[in-house]
Amino acid sequence: TPEVWVQVQMEATELSSFTVHCGFLGPGSISLVTVSWGGPDGAGGTKLAVLHPELGTRQWAPARQARWETQSSISLALEDSGASSPFANTTFCCKFASFPEGSWESCGSLPPSSDPGLSAPPTPVPILRADL
C-alpha cells in the first residue's frame, strides 16, 4: 500500500525557520503535491504550496520556498514572522496525487521534544486508515 511520510524540522541557526519534508512511498508517478497547514486542504487547513512536476510550483505566505527533492519527495521552507513560533504546534499535511492510482495524504508536526536542528523521524502519520 502506498504511503506518505511527513517530517517537520526547525532550523538550528534560525529558530523562526522551519522546513517540511514530504515523500511518497509507492508505485506510480506523482502528478501533484499539495501542502497545507492546520489540517488537510478542504478540511479546515490552509494551502501553503502546490507542486507540479512539469508546470512548476505555487506557494503562499508564510511558505518561502517549495521544491522537489526527488521525483517522489518535496520540501517546503517556512518563515515564521511571529516571535512566538506558532509553527511548533502546527500540523502540516501533504497530499500526493498519482494518476491513475489516486491520492494519498498524511500529516505531521514538530515533535514536542525536538531540539533545534534535529529533524523529526520520517514516521508517517496517516490521517486516513492505511487500508483506504
Epitope: S29, H52, A97, P100
Partner: antibody, heavy 120, light 107 residues
Framework: DVKLVESGGGLVKLGGSLKLSCAAS????????MSWIRQTPEKRLELVAA????????YYLDTVKGRFTISRDNAKNTLYLQMSSLKSEDTALYYC?????????????WGQGTSVTVSS | SIVMTQTPKFLLVSAGDRVTITCKAS??????VAWYQEKPGQSPKLLMY???HRFTGVPDRFTGSGYGTDFTFTINTVQAEDLAVYFC?????????FGGGTKLEIK
C-alpha cells in the same frame, strides 16, 4: 478552444471488436491524462479506462480487463480504445475526457460521445 | 471500490426554488469530489471540482460543500436551463466512481 471528437462506434456482433478514436485539439495533448467513460442505457456513468500523459500508466475497469486496451499517440493528438470480445453489457455511449491535475483529476472537458451497440 | 450513493434520484421543482443533492462515499475521499451536469442531448460538463470550486463560467448559484464522506451540491434559485441530470464523482482512489445521478425537472 478545447475539442474532443470521438469516432469508431457502431453496431457490432457479440464477441466482435471495435476501435474507438478520440481526436484532441485546442490544448497540449501530451500534457494531459485522458480516459474513456461510458454511459450505459440505464444512464449510469463508468470510467472504463484511463491513461496518463506519457502513456505509461493505465487503468481498466475490472469488467473490461483483458478485453479493452487504452492507448494514445501524442504525435497525432489521438486517444484510442481497442475493444474486443465484446459483450452485451458493453453497449453504451462512450466518451473520451481530459483530466486536469490542478482540479483533483476532475474531467474538465468531454467529447460528444460515440455509440457502441453489441447485438446477438 | 468506493461507492458513491447519490440522493435523491429525481427532483421536481419550480423555477426559483433551492435544490440540494447529496452524495455519500462508502469511505473517505478527502476533497476529491467533482460534480457534473448532463443536459438532454449533451455530454456531461464539469461544474465543481475539489468539492466547492466552480469551473470556468459556472454561475455562482451552484455551490458545493463537504469533506471525507458527506458531500452536498446546491442550486440556489433554480432556473429553467438547469434541467439536467447531475452526477457526483470521486477521483480520490481508483477505481474512480460516480454517483447514480439526480434528474432535475422543472415544473
Amino acid at each position: 478552444d478545447v475539442k474532443l471528437v470521438e469516432s469508431g462506434g457502431g453496431l457490432v456482433k457479440l464477441g466482435g471488436s471495435l476501435k474507438l478514436s478520440c481526436a484532441a485539439s485546442g490544448f497540449t495533448f501530451s500534457s494531459y491524462h485522458m480516459s474513456w467513460i461510458r454511459q450505459t442505457p440505464e444512464k449510469r456513468l463508468e470510467l472504463v479506462a484511463a491513461i496518463n500523459s506519457n502513456g505509461i500508466n493505465t487503468y481498466y475497469l475490472d469488467t473490461v480487463k483483458g478485453r479493452f486496451t487504452i492507448s494514445r499517440d501524442n504525435a497525432k493528438n489521438t486517444l484510442y480504445l481497442q475493444m474486443s470480445s465484446l459483450k452485451s453489457e458493453d453497449t453504451a455511449l462512450y466518451y473520451c475526457a481530459r483530466h486536469e491535475d490542478y482540479y483533483g483529476f476532475a474531467m474538465d472537458y468531454w467529447g460528444q460521445g460515440t455509440s457502441v451497440t453489441v447485438s446477438s | 471500490s468506493i461507492v458513491m450513493t447519490q440522493t435523491p434520484k429525481f427532483l421536481l421543482v419550480s423555477a426559483g426554488d433551492r435544490v440540494t443533492i447529496t452524495c455519500k462515499a462508502s469511505q473517505s475521499v478527502s476533497n476529491d469530489v467533482a460534480w457534473y451536469q448532463e443536459k438532454p442531448g449533451q455530454s456531461p460538463k464539469l461544474l465543481m471540482y475539489y468539492v466547492s470550486h466552480r469551473f470556468t463560467g459556472v454561475p455562482d448559484r451552484f455551490t458545493g460543500s463537504g469533506y471525507g464522506t458527506d458531500f452536498t451540491f446546491t442550486i440556489n434559485t433554480v432556473q429553467a436551463e438547469d434541467l439536467a441530470v447531475y452526477f457526483c464523482h470521486q477521483a480520490y482512489r481508483s477505481p474512480w466512481t460516480f454517483g447514480g445521478g439526480t434528474k432535475l425537472e422543472i415544473k
